[in-house]
């Protein structure tokens, strides 16, 4: 391998296309993201440029380490596509396109409870709905902070429903639900709803 001024002396396999990636692929508007442009050849003095469509967003150089471009996704059109150009003197190669998926975060869901009380049992129906947020939304129901349902996926703006039957409890139970969509590490919870213990008219949700 010679230290040469003319990059055209390089073989194609010595200078393949760069790779453009981000740890975060699903984002919400206003989110800050980091994009990484890297190259397999760790010996070359590479100049990396980032583009969104035809707009030049920035340039960095690096050898043996990726270029890191920090961006803020504020508008829908900023989802992409992004391209990274790696240049060594007069040689340049482009990465594949990379696009973010912009997802509206879920708002705190509302939990509604309906109970049919019999002498021995309570038949409980839990409804959970988040009125805002990109679909699909996964709902999970909790009793006393323990998940009691699998994730229920809703592809429409209809409440998730979960039924359970319980022996009339002697202690009050607390229910809440979680709403989550494709935004990683972003889940919202309903206000807790407390079911009182049996006795008297202490079941405000009950249909008798």
């Amino acid at each position: 391998r010679k230290a040469v001024l003319d990059c055209e002396a390089m073989k194609t396999n010595e200078f393949p296309s760069p790779c453009l990636d981000s740890k975060t692929k699903v984002v919400m508007k206003g989110q800050n993201v980091s994009m990484f442009c890297s190259h397999k050849n760790k010996s070359l003095q590479i100049t990396y440029s980032l583009f969104r469509r035809k707009t030049h967003l920035g340039t960095q150089d690096g050898k043996g380490e990726p270029a890191i471009f920090n961006l803020s996704i504020t508008e829908a059109h900023e989802s992409g596509p992004y391209k990274c150009k790696a240049q060594v003197t007069s040689c340049s190669k482009y990465s594949r396109d990379f696009s973010f998926t912009i997802v509206d975060p879920v708002t705190s869901p509302v939990l509604n409870i309906m109970v049919i009380q019999t002498e021995t049992d309570r038949h409980i129906t839990l409804h959970c709905l988040s009125v805002n947020g990109s679909l699909p939304i996964n709902y999970t129901f909790f009793e006393n902070h323990v998940a009691i349902s699998p994730a229920i996926s809703k592809y429409d703006r209809e409440p998730a429903e979960f039924n359970l039957t319980k022996k009339n409890p002697g202690e009050e139970e607390e229910y809440r639900c979680e709403a989550k969509n494709r935004l990683p590490n972003y889940a919202t919870y309903s206000h807790p709803v407390t079911m009182p213990s049996t006795g008297g008219d202490s079941c405000p949700f009950c249909l008798k």
């Epitope: 230290a3 040469v4 990059c7 003095q45 340039t59 240049q87 003197t89």
Partner: antibody, heavy 117, light 111 residues
Framework: EVQLVESGGGLVQPGGSLRLSCAAS????????MIWVRQAPGKCLEWIGI???????YFANWAKGRFTISRDNSKNTVYLQMNSLRAEDTAVYYC???????????WGQGTLVTVSS | DIQMTQSPSSLSASVGDRVTITCQAS??????LSWYQQKPGKAPKLLIY???TLASGVPSRFSGSGSGTDFTLTISSLQPEDFATYYC?????????????FGQGTKVEIK
């Protein structure tokens, strides 16, 4: 023939300014990172700074504020502007492009700058 | 900021001797180090780059080793044309202010 020629050196008074040129022939400087290096008489090589292919410049701490590097791609030339010159800036000044691996391989013959009253 | 400390500053040797020059970086620079030979009144000449890769046209008696902070240039059998001053040049992987520096040089003289 591929070569670099530095020019613009000479005698200058303390406090004066000088602009050195580094012209390339036989190849285009446009896409190359260019560094400036100097060597005082009988002393070691000293890195001054670099201009990237995308026109960003970086300097040794001692050169910041007094020295600037620019490039004119249409003239295939890189410049070193030196202001507020001092006696200790007396040296031979070299330019060199980085090769594809990021090392200066091709050097000019240098241009001598003498700062004296 | 990067500083390169080269040693020894000078050495006397005879033709045929094995000569070793060391260079230490103030911070880790991976393998981003090159070695240069300079003769009086001449521009530097690249010998080694990437710490251990021999530059084009350089005799194989020259070799380089090291990574991180400690680097070595070795001349296995000193020849008459090798009497010169040798410099290391260290750099970070990304261009930055004060991100490149030469060592102080090692003058190899005839004993």
């Amino acid at each position: 023939e591929v070569q670099l020629v530095e020019s613009g050196g000479g005698l200058v008074q303390p406090g004066g300014s000088l602009r050195l040129s580094c012209a390339a022939s036989g190849f285009s400087l446009n896409n190359y990172f260019m560094i400036w290096v100097r060597q005082a008489p009988g002393k070691c090589l000293e890195w001054i700074g670099i201009i990237t292919s995308y026109h960003t410049t970086y300097f040794a701490n001692w050169a910041k504020g007094r020295f600037t590097i620019s490039r004119d791609n249409s003239k295939n030339t890189v410049y070193l502007q030196m202001n507020s010159l001092r006696a200790e800036d007396t040296a031979v000044y070299y330019c060199a492009p980085y090769d594809i691996y990021g090392y200066p391989t091709l050097w000019g013959q240098g241009t001598l700058v003498t700062v004296s009253s | 900021d990067i500083q390169m400390t080269q040693s020894p500053s000078s050495l006397s040797a005879s033709v045929g001797d094995r000569v070793t020059i060391t260079c230490q970086a103030s911070q880790s620079i991976g393998a981003y180090l090159s070695w240069y030979q300079q003769k009086p009144g001449k521009a530097p000449k690249l010998l080694i780059y990437e710490a251990s890769t021999l530059a084009s046209g350089v005799p194989s008696r020259f070799s380089g080793s090291g990574s991180g902070t400690d680097f070595t240039l070795t001349i296995s059998s000193l020849q008459p044309e090798d009497f010169a001053t040798y410099y290391c040049l260290g750099a970070y992987g990304r261009s930055s202010d004060d991100g490149t520096a030469f060592g102080q040089g090692t003058k190899v003289e005839i004993k």
